[in-house]
Interface confidence: medium
């Protein structure tokens, strides 16, 4: 494979509903038709897979039914949305792109997007 550049924003703030969206853009050196995108979370030097999807260029990304991720693709850009985030999920989310077909295989790993999640303050009980 050849190295492939992957760009993603440095910082994203999740919404009060625990939803964070960011764009993962890759500089495709080849004419890929099959692409695999993986979101990795790095925290305390531990790297875990958050979600992954394989898609055909021009088609929708298909994550597993129980995945916390959704996404759309447009050209060499993938718009990723991660849901159900809580404060404890704050961390560096890395976009990994693999051009699976046709050969040769290309791999690109972004520098990561720091996602900050702030749990909403509970509404105070009100006495009327």
């Amino acid at each position: 494979c050849k190295a492939m550049h992957v760009a993603q924003p440095a910082v994203v703030l999740a919404s009060s509903r625990g939803i964070a969206s960011f764009v993962c853009e890759y500089a495709s050196p080849g004419k890929a038709t099959e692409v695999r995108v993986t979101v990795l979370r790095q925290a305390d030097s531990q790297v875990t897979e958050v979600c992954a999807a394989t898609y055909m260029m021009g088609n929708e990304l298909t994550f597993l039914d129980d995945s916390i991720c959704t996404g759309t693709s447009s050209g060499n850009q993938v718009n990723l949305t991660i849901q159900g985030l809580r404060a404890m999920d704050t961390g560096l989310y890395i976009c990994k792109v693999e051009l699976m077909y046709p050969p040769p295989y290309y791999l690109g790993i972004g520098n990561g997007t720091q996602i900050y999640v702030i749990d909403p303050e509970p509404c105070p009980d009100s006495d009327f």
Epitope: C1, A3, E34, A52, M100, Y101, P104
Partner: antibody, heavy 115, light 111 residues
């Protein structure tokens, strides 16, 4: 854990065909394709080709084009490699490996071609 | 004759550092394609050792390191151990053959 389990030893006559299977487990089958590699006795590794288990696209080494067919069966999470018109120099260990990056390998299937 | 040339054998005493070269051309390594390394212990299937020139999969000791420059690549094993006795193969894409090509293989012997 991720595993690739290949079918057993095959002994074939020249001109015959062989079909080697590779049963995958421990990961999402359609997320990775399969690479097939062979190794003749006492020789090095030889890349035969690759198949996507996402949509069945294939890419074969020119040497095997027209003689090899790679397929996958999503229902059984199994990949297959069929080689036709066997010759004595097809005698080798045949390996399947996960994805084009070949990060996990099967144990190998010995194919002997002899009259 | 392999498109990627490796020395047939290298040897070293336990604890020593050995280097295996993989020499290609402008249609493979020199064209910018990554080099991957595989270790094949006697009687077993190959195992991915280094991918993308210098990255190690989890579980591979940091005694193994890879590098690439120009039309060649190399694999270094530092602190050689008896369990490192194996055959080592490099792999890269060749755009003129339109196929992946393995190196000729190098047998590492621990003296």
């Amino acid at each position: 854990q991720v595993q690739l389990q290949q079918s057993g030893t095959e002994v074939k006559k020249p001109g015959a065909s062989v079909k080697v299977s590779c049963k995958a487990s421990g990961y999402i089958f359609t997320s990775y394709g399969f690479t097939w590699v062979r190794q003749a006795p006492g020789q090095g590794l030889e890349w035969m080709g690759w198949i996507s288990s996402y949509n069945g696209n294939t890419d074969y080494a020119q040497k095997f084009e027209g003689r090899v067919t790679m397929t996958t069966d999503t229902s059984t999470t199994t990949a297959y490699m069929e080689l036709r018109g066997l010759k004595s120099d097809d005698t080798a260990m045949y390996y399947c490996a996960r994805g084009p990056q070949m990060d996990v390998w099967g144990q190998g299937t010995t194919v002997t071609v002899s009259s | 004759q392999s498109v990627l040339t490796q020395p047939p054998s290298v040897s070293g005493a336990p604890g020593q550092r050995v280097t295996i070269s993989c020499t290609g051309s402008s249609s493979n390594i020199g064209a910018g394609y990554d080099v991957h390394w595989y270790q094949q212990l006697p009687g077993t299937a190959p195992k991915l050792l280094i991918y993308g020139n210098s990255s190690r999969p989890s579980g591979v000791p940091d005694r193994f390191s890879g590098s690439k420059s120009g039309t060649s690549a190399s694999l270094a094993i530092s602190g050689l151990q008896s369990e490192d006795e194996a055959d080592y193969y490099c792999l890269s894409w060749d755009e003129s053959l339109n196929a992946y090509v393995f190196g000729s293989g190098t047998k590492v012997t621990v003296l």
